[in-house]
């Protein structure tokens, strides 16, 4: 049960061609399913059935992005066409360098995520809930650029560096 | 680190009253912060959150009732209009810094009695 | 609306006996489950997370299982300074909450 520490950073443009950065930090927690490691990348938010489509070449996105997907409720999909791991290996396949799972409406995600997997992914699986996946998907549903840091953990407060 | 509740006292009912958690050790930047109520003999209320001095939550009973606010080393809570039922000890928690959403690090708590 | 029902309300044990606490959520928290012990007239203090990992310096006759919708919180060999009211929490939602918390347990030591 190792702790993801989630650093979103959202970038708004002005009018003037300028960027203004909004950084959220967000906790959540890394699955057996994938890699307890760091990764980072812009986000690209996922619709479940999305990746369902088998056919790779149609939305394969650069190489490094992070996937976000909002499960729903099972009674929503009672016959899903992938198994959550199964959707966390498919973002993969497709350049995903981590997978973060917003869990809230399926917690029963949490275990399919956690089985012990005799071949996890080599790139991590996150699961938020709560305030943090809505903290999460507000950023999101913004359609705006936004970049997620994955981290095992939590990023320094600026009174932590020390002056050498 | 610590936390430590003030503000606590007497008041008729209908009177503002304002509630502050003092903490220190740790920046408020980096930890969620929850109010819990005790009336007395009763169990444990949640009253709500507040996540990082912008994001707020509250139990359904205690929306409009209550307001909770943060500066940079405190964290406020108003009861808008209290009533008797509102008498209790009042405390303020740390959440914990992972997902588990266990409040961690208590205050002693501040007692609030309304009556007229 | 995630709702916690705690069982019994009250219980009575021998000292070096074993009490067992029952906390139910009206729906699937997962894991996300805490207990803590409440002695009166002192702030409420974190004994389990996650259902079963025991928080920092809390003695291993504290022990925690459960997920889903049931947990159960037990305490093996109490002693005298068990005595007191044990909570549990949910830590799944924050929103369209009435209260995180169950209604408390009080553990009587005789």
């Known amino acids: 049960k190792e702790t993801a520490f989630v650093e979103v950073v959202l970038f708004e443009s002005s009018p003037s061609g300028d960027y203004t950065t909004y950084t959220t930090g967000l906790t959540g927690r890394f699955s057996r399913a994938g890699a307890t490691l760091s990764a980072e990348g812009e986000i690209v938010q996922m619709h479940p059935l999305g990746l369902c489509n088998n056919n790779d070449e149609e939305d394969l996105y650069e190489y490094g992005w992070v996937g976000v997907v909002k499960l729903e409720q099972p009674e929503l999909d009672p016959k899903p066409c992938l198994t959550v791991l199964g959707k966390a290996k498919r973002a993969v396949q497709r350049g995903a360098t981590a997978v973060i799972f917003d869990v809230s409406e399926n917690p029963e995600a949490i275990d399919q995520l956690n089985q012990g997997s005799e071949d996890p992914l080599k790139r991590p699986v996150v699961y938020v809930k709560g305030a943090d996946a809505i903290k999460l998907m507000n950023i999101v549903n913004k359609q705006k650029v936004a970049r997620a840091r994955i981290q095992h953990r939590p990023p320094r407060q600026p009174t932590e560096y020390f002056d050498m | 680190q610590s936390v430590e509740e003030s503000g606590g006292r007497l008041v008729t009912p209908g009177t503002p009253l304002t509630l502050t958690c003092t903490v220190s050790?740790?920046?408020?930047?980096?930890?969620?912060m929850g109010w819990v109520r005790q009336a007395p003999g009763k169990g444990l209320e949640w009253i709500g959150i507040?996540?990082?001095?912008?994001t707020t939550y509250y139990a359904s009973w205690a929306k409009g009732r209550f307001t909770i606010s943060e500066t940079s080393t405190t964290v406020d809570l108003k009861i808008t209009s209290p009533t008797t039922e509102d008498t209790a000890t009042y405390f303020c928690?740390?959440?914990?810094?992972?997902?588990?959403?266990?409040?961690?690090?208590w205050g002693p708590g501040t007692l609030v009695t309304v009556s007229s | 609306a995630y709702d916690m029902t705690q069982t019994p309300a009250s219980v009575e044990v021998a000292v070096g006996g074993t009490v067992t606490i029952k906390c139910q959520a009206s729906?699937?928290?997962?894991?996300?489950l805490n207990w803590y012990q409440q002695k009166r007239g002192q702030p409420p203090k974190l004994l389990i997370y996650?259902?079963?990992t025991l928080a920092s310096g809390v003695p291993s006759r504290f022990s925690g299982s459960g997920s889903g919708t049931e947990f159960t919180l037990t305490i093996s060999g109490v002693q005298c300074d068990d005595a007191a009211t044990y909570y549990c929490?949910?830590?799944?939602?924050?929103?369209?909450?009435?209260?995180?918390f169950g209604g408390g347990t009080e553990v009587v030591v005789k």
């Open positions: 928690a740390r959440k914990s810094d992972d997902d588990s959403d266990s409040y961690l690090l």
């Open positions: 050790g740790f920046s408020l930047s980096s930890y969620a």
């Open positions: 929490q949910q830590g799944w939602s924050s929103t369209n909450i009435d209260n995180i």
């Open positions: 996650d259902a079963s």
């Open positions: 507040i996540y990082a001095g912008d």
């Open positions: 729906q699937s928290i997962s894991s996300y």
